[in-house]
């Protein structure tokens, strides 16, 4: 019997200090560039080697960025989201959603990794 794939979703506040070459990551998404079906959110698509985000170590490719310095990223055009990051200042606070894939046992049985009750 095939296993079931679940996701463990957690949120984290990440404070980054802009480095010499910036924050050091790429994004996809936006109302005009949906990366995930039925979700116009902003996602991290690349962490640049030796950049501020990589050196901090907490932000991961695939993370959804919910807000920047308290400003919600919902319903933004892609380029508007890019501009928001570029104009965010030296100290940047990111509210991010991590989505960890959890492989469970056969359907009908709760495996050890099952995040439910």
């Amino acid at each position: 019997m095939n296993g079931r794939v679940d996701y463990l979703v957690t949120e984290e506040e990440i404070n980054l200090t802009r480095g010499p070459s910036g924050l050091g990551f790429n994004i996809v998404g936006g109302t005009d560039q949906q990366y995930v079906s039925n979700d116009s959110g902003i996602y991290v698509s690349r962490i640049k080697e030796n950049g501020a985000a990589a050196l901090d170590g907490r932000l991961q490719e695939g993370d959804k960025i919910l807000s920047v310095n308290g400003q919600d990223l919902k319903n933004l055009l892609h380029q508007d989201a890019v501009d928001l990051f570029r104009n965010a200042g030296y100290a940047v606070s990111l509210r991010v959603q991590h989505r960890l894939q959890v492989q469970n046992g056969p359907i009908g049985h709760r495996g050890e990794g099952d995040p439910s009750g």
Epitope: G22, G24, V28, Y35, Q79, V82, R86
Partner: nanobody
Framework: DVQLVESGGGSVQAGGSLRLSCTAS????????MAWFRQAPGKEREFVAA??????YYADSVTGRFTISRDNAKNTVYLQMNSLKPEDTAVYYC?????????????????????WGQGTQVTVS
């Protein structure tokens, strides 16, 4: 990683035209920033053109002669090269990176890109 395959190179006389194509394997091609670089024998790799979500960028040496475009339905980026000169002779490489940098975009910096094609030779005599 995305696989990139260039085509369309060849030999042409000065003043002639060629159209290079670069086809990518990724399922979210429309989100990729794409670029063309070139390398002549004995010279460093040189930026030619790039296309991101926000628009197109060109090296001064090709502005007005070359045009970069993309067809997201075909997962392909093109480089239309007109009024070719002998100094355009080089191996032309396609490069890609997923998404847009949140930092100042430097289209001519090879470190902006993660994936590279094998190249296609262009010879102008």
């Amino acid at each position: 990683d995305v696989q990139l395959v260039e085509s369309g190179g060849g030999s042409v006389q000065a003043g002639g035209s060629l159209r290079l194509s670069c086809t990518a394997s990724g399922r979210t091609f429309s989100t990729y920033t794409m670029a063309w670089f070139r390398q002549a024998p004995g010279k460093e790799r040189e930026f030619v053109a790039a296309i991101s979500w926000s628009g197109a960028y060109y090296a001064d040496s090709v502005t007005g002669r070359f045009t970069i475009s993309r067809d997201n339905a075909k997962n392909t980026v093109y480089l239309q090269m007109n009024s070719l000169k002998p100094e355009d002779t080089a191996v032309y490489y396609c490069a890609a990176v997923i998404g847009s940098t949140v930092d100042s975009y430097r289209p001519g910096d090879p470190l902006e890109y993660d994936d590279w094609g094998q190249g296609t030779q262009v010879t102008v005599s």
